[in-house]
Interface confidence: medium
């Protein structure tokens, strides 16, 4: 029988900057029942507080509701594991809610094949930001990424849509059924999960155009460029 091993706070996430949850991994239990408590203080304060809600986030978690969540304040937190033989502390973790936002996926993804008489046909997609995100306040800049592939293909084709909530693609394989998904990321946070796949059948008479993958700048209202997922994860706006 031993004191408990060192726990580790391994993840903190917020859906919208208004609440957040942190999770920890217990260390070894030392062969005895072990109690865990999370304590925290805010940057510039010395008063320690205990986790306000150990239930909402599930086992080994601490949930901070609206009244406990401050933007632009760093939270300094640690977990204490205690059994009859002694205690151990996790390393401190520093959490700024601005940096840990992982939104829900975008909503209402609509995909249509557009075949204007005077222009080449294109695939048009439109979506809405996740419900919990209030873009009107200016707290958020959401970036979007789209991926699509023929139903039987292994590889996804990925496009960066910037802050737009619609996108047009010219070059597709006629007669194929495509899966389309979209995800979003706040400027300092994490990518959401991909939205549920939307299926679209590309007509057999859809004209291929390999030279112009994306519709022109004036049609899109801004320059388009392809950015890798890794680049984008580290893409910060200041």
């Amino acid at each position: 029988q031993l004191p408990p091993g060192k726990p580790e706070i391994f993840k903190c996430r917020s859906p919208n900057k208004e609440t957040f949850t942190c999770w920890w991994r217990p260390g070894t239990d030392g062969g005895l029942p072990t109690n865990y408590s999370l304590t925290y203080h805010r940057e510039g304060e010395t008063l320690m507080h205990e986790c306000p809600d150990y239930i909402t986030g599930g086992p080994n978690s601490c949930h901070f509701g609206k009244q406990y969540t401050s933007m632009w304040r760093t939270y300094v937190m640690m977990v204490n594991a205690t059994n009859q033989m002694g205690s151990s502390f996790s390393d401190e973790l520093y959490v700024d809610v601005t940096y840990i936002v992982q939104p829900d996926p975008p909503l209402e993804l609509t995909v249509e094949v557009k075949q204007p008489e005077d222009r080449k046909p294109y695939l048009w997609m439109k979506w809405s930001p996740p419900t919990l995100i209030d873009l009107k306040t200016g707290w958020f800049t959401l970036l979007y990424e789209i991926r699509l592939k023929p139903e039987k293909a292994a590889e996804w084709e990925t496009h960066f849509a910037g802050q737009q909530t619609e996108f047009k693609i010219l070059s597709l394989h006629p007669g194929q059924k495509y899966l389309v998904q979209v995800r979003c990321k706040p400027d300092h946070g994490y990518w959401s999960a991909w939205s549920p796949a939307t299926f679209i059948q590309i007509p057999s008479d859809f004209i291929m155009n390999d030279e112009q993958k994306l519709i022109s700048e004036e049609d899109l209202g801004g320059e388009q460029k392809l950015i890798s997922e890794e680049d984008l994860h580290h893409h910060h706006h200041h």
């Epitope: 010395t46 401190e92 959490v95 700024d96 940096y99 946070g189 580290h234």
Partner: antibody, heavy 120, light 113 residues
Framework: EVQLLESGGGLVQPGGTLRLSCAAS????????MSWVRQAPGKGLEWVSS????????YYADSVKGRFTISRDNSKNTLFLLMNSLRAEDTAAYYC?????????????WGQGTLVTVSS | DIVMTQSPDSLTVSLGARTTINCQSS????????????LAWYQQKPGLPPKLLIY???TRESGVPDRFSGSGSGTDFTLTISSLQAEDVAIYYC?????????FGQGTKLEIN
């Protein structure tokens, strides 16, 4: 106003011992990690040792491990560095530095430094 | 140990010019738990102790002029001075505080021509 005042430096022979002190004021000393960082003449910065608010949590550079001991007296707002078995390569200005947080994350205030010269 | 490498070792720049100093870490200092890069930038003027300019790779310390900014993530970081002033002549150091031993870059000496 945050102030950190180092003392205890001087000339010592190789193999000798010195004890550096750092008197802190202007902030709640017990709430912050503290560190020692050194700078050899004309050279860059080298982290030496840190101590968290829980005094049992101490960390050392490999170059000083087993020879130097960091400690703190929260009741006197003072940080210490006991340096044993000193070598010529320990010659440097030693800075006391306050961490931004309770652990060792970035040093937001530094003392003026105290010079340690190890020479025969 | 994490090795921090700065470039260039020294640079001479005109007053008012935009200046960048680069810092590369030998392994990532971005923590997935809180999405923070554990990197700081310091300025050291002759005969004085270092002064903290930037922490968490991009957060400006209070009182630091807004011409100083930090950017980058993972292993590659940049300190930018948007318009160089005479008082910015100094040596600049990056430092990682992701893992002990906490390590500094070798320094970049900034001078005015």
């Amino acid at each position: 106003e945050v102030q950190l005042l180092e003392s205890g430096g001087g000339l010592v022979q190789p193999g000798g011992t010195l004890r550096l002190s750092c008197a802190a004021s202007g902030f709640t000393f017990s709430a912050y990690a503290m560190s020692w960082v050194r700078q050899a003449p004309g050279k860059g910065l080298e982290w030496v040792s840190s101590i968290n608010v829980r005094a049992g949590d101490t960390y050392y550079a490999d170059s000083v491990k087993g020879r130097f001991t960091i400690s703190r007296d929260n009741s006197k707002n003072t940080l210490f560095l006991l340096m044993n078995s000193l070598r010529a390569e320990d010659t440097a200005a030693y800075y006391c530095a306050k961490a931004r947080y309770s652990s060792n994350w970035g040093f937001d205030f530094w003392g003026q430094g105290t010079l340690v010269t190890v020479s025969s | 140990d994490i090795v921090m490498t700065q470039s260039p070792d020294s640079l001479t720049v005109s007053l008012g010019a935009r200046t960048t100093i680069n810092c590369q870490s030998s392994q990532t200092i971005l923590h997935s738990s809180n999405n923070h890069n554990y990197l700081a930038w310091y300025q050291q003027k002759p005969g004085l102790p270092p002064k903290l300019l930037i922490y968490w790779s991009s957060t400006r310390e209070s009182g630091v002029p807004d011409r100083f900014s930090g950017s980058g993530s993972g292993t590659d970081f940049t300190l930018t001075i948007s318009s160089l002033q005479a008082e910015d002549v100094a040596i600049y150091y990056c430092q990682q505080y992701s893992n002990t031993p906490y390590t500094f870059g070798q320094g970049t000496k900034l001078e005015i021509n």
